[in-house]
């Protein structure tokens, strides 16, 4: 054979990744690998993630003599060690002028009354702990409730017996019940007076308020 | 609060055996590696290896390969370090370590062990 | 091993004077995420090594403000604005962007 086709071990280089090619013999060669490779030819990076120091679920992304860390959202840093300040990243995280509180591997909301959820999204359902009488309806409300009394009752519990039902108030006067003691209030039309609006009054004086 | 407590001072003779402790709290124990750091008298510290709490793993400096093992009780949230024939070269202050901020951020009160005939 | 170099190995320094020591990497610090992974920590007498600054230049919580880190690559600075009797110890830097972390050899901070 001509002298064209000898093998020359290292011409041209087999080693990749920047391996360098060493003549060992006539027939043979050495690659001396950069950090990171191996294999006869250099040709395999090596894997750098085995017991990797990615904490808090990070996920380890070999690289070429190195690694790094994918960390999870809540977490950041070389090692996913630092704690991500939500509460900067995000000023709306709470809502409803809930007060944002920054902790190890998360946040916190603290919620005004009446709204709780992480967010403070949910409107605490205040009639769950309400204590409306019986028959009457509970209305939700934000931090407070109230109860839509049934026919015949008042109150703000709709616990009393609501006094406007006998028509205490005469000559068309508009009954209202004080929603404190189930008492009448008799509003009296022009020209009377009274607790029930039975009395004449002088012409002037009108609307007269009465309690009872 | 993060806190990492270890185990009283020790004097050993070359050859015998000695485990010493460090006691996390305040932080998910699983979540973070621990770290064993030496220091030599009056020499700077020196990075020994670590474990990874939840799995048992373990990660060495090659210098100290083979010299001691390293071990961890997750639900005493305790890791150890230990030797199984010491040397007068092994006298030295022993620090555990948590990663944090920076690599170890948070650091244990040290235990002194000492090798002597 | 990346080889961190310090100096000076003492530092006689006074009160309310300011203090720098210099560290030295053998290899670029700068990780191939575009972090630079240099720490520096303090060692008072008899105590563990406390963290001050991470990635060359971030005070860790606690730390007083006298205290500043700079550099960039392979050379980093610690900075003592004005020196009190309590910064007395060891000053040790650390890298912890090529496996394995490494510190330097210490700095011994002393009141002239």
């Known amino acids: 054979a001509g002298s064209d086709s000898l093998y020359v071990p290292c011409a041209p280089s087999p080693c990749v990744n920047g391996g360098t090619c060493r003549q060992t013999g006539d027939f043979t060669f050495e690659c001396n690998c950069l950090p990171g490779f191996e294999g006869s030819t250099c040709e395999r990076n090596i894997d750098d993630c085995p017991n990797h120091r990615c904490q808090n679920g990070g996920v380890c992304v070999d690289g070429v003599n190195t690694y790094n860390c994918r960390c999870p959202p809540q977490w950041t840093g070389q090692f996913c060690t630092e704690d991500v300040d939500e509460c900067l990243l995000q000023p709306n995280a709470c809502q409803n002028g809930g007060t944002c509180a920054n902790r190890n591997g998360g946040y916190g909301c603290v919620c005004v009354n009446g709204w709780s959820g992480d967010d403070c999204s949910e409107n605490i359902d205040d009639c769950a702990f309400a204590s409306c009488t019986p028959g009457s309806t509970c209305i939700d409300r934000v931090a407070s409730f109230s109860c839509m009394c049934p026919e015949g009752k008042a109150g703000l519990l709709c616990h009393l017996d609501d006094a406007c039902i006998s028509n205490p108030c005469h000559k068309g006067a508009l009954c209202d019940t004080n929603p404190l003691n189930g008492q009448y209030i008799c509003t009296c039309p022009q020209g009377y007076k009274g607790a029930d609006c039975t009395e004449d009054v002088d012409e002037g004086n009108s609307h007269h308020h009465h309690h009872h | 609060e993060v806190q990492l407590v270890q185990s009283g001072a020790e004097v050993k003779k070359p050859g015998e055996s000695l485990k010493i402790s460090c006691k996390g709290s305040g932080y998910t124990f699983s979540n973070y590696v621990i770290h064993w750091v030496r220091q030599m008298p009056g020499k700077g510290p020196e990075w020994t290896g670590y474990?990874?709490?939840?799995?048992?793993?373990?990660k060495f400096n090659e210098k100290f390969k083979g010299q001691a093992t390293i071990s961890v009780d997750k639900s005493s949230t305790t890791a150890y370090l230990q030797w199984s024939s010491l040397k007068a070269s092994d006298t030295a202050m022993y620090y555990c370590a948590r990663d944090g901020a920076g690599s170890f951020t948070y650091w244990g009160q040290g235990t002194l062990v000492t090798v002597s005939s | 091993d990346v080889v961190m170099t310090q100096s000076p190995l003492s530092l006689p320094v006074t009160l309310g004077q300011p203090a720098s020591i210099s560290c030295r990497s053998s290899q670029s610090l700068v990780h191939s995420d575009g972090n630079t992974y240099l720490h520096w920590f303090q060692q008072r007498p008899g105590q563990s090594p406390r963290l001050l600054i991470y990635?060359?230049?971030n005070r860790f919580s606690g730390v007083p403000d006298r205290f500043s880190g700079s550099g960039s690559g392979t050379d980093f600075t610690l900075k003592i604005s004005r020196v009190e009797a309590e910064d007395v110890g060891v000053y040790y830097c650390l890298q912890s962007t090529h496996f394995p972390d490494t510190f330097g050899g210490g700095t011994k901070v002393e009141i002239k």
């Open positions: 474990i990874i709490p939840g799995s048992g793993g373990t």
């Open positions: 990635r060359i230049s």
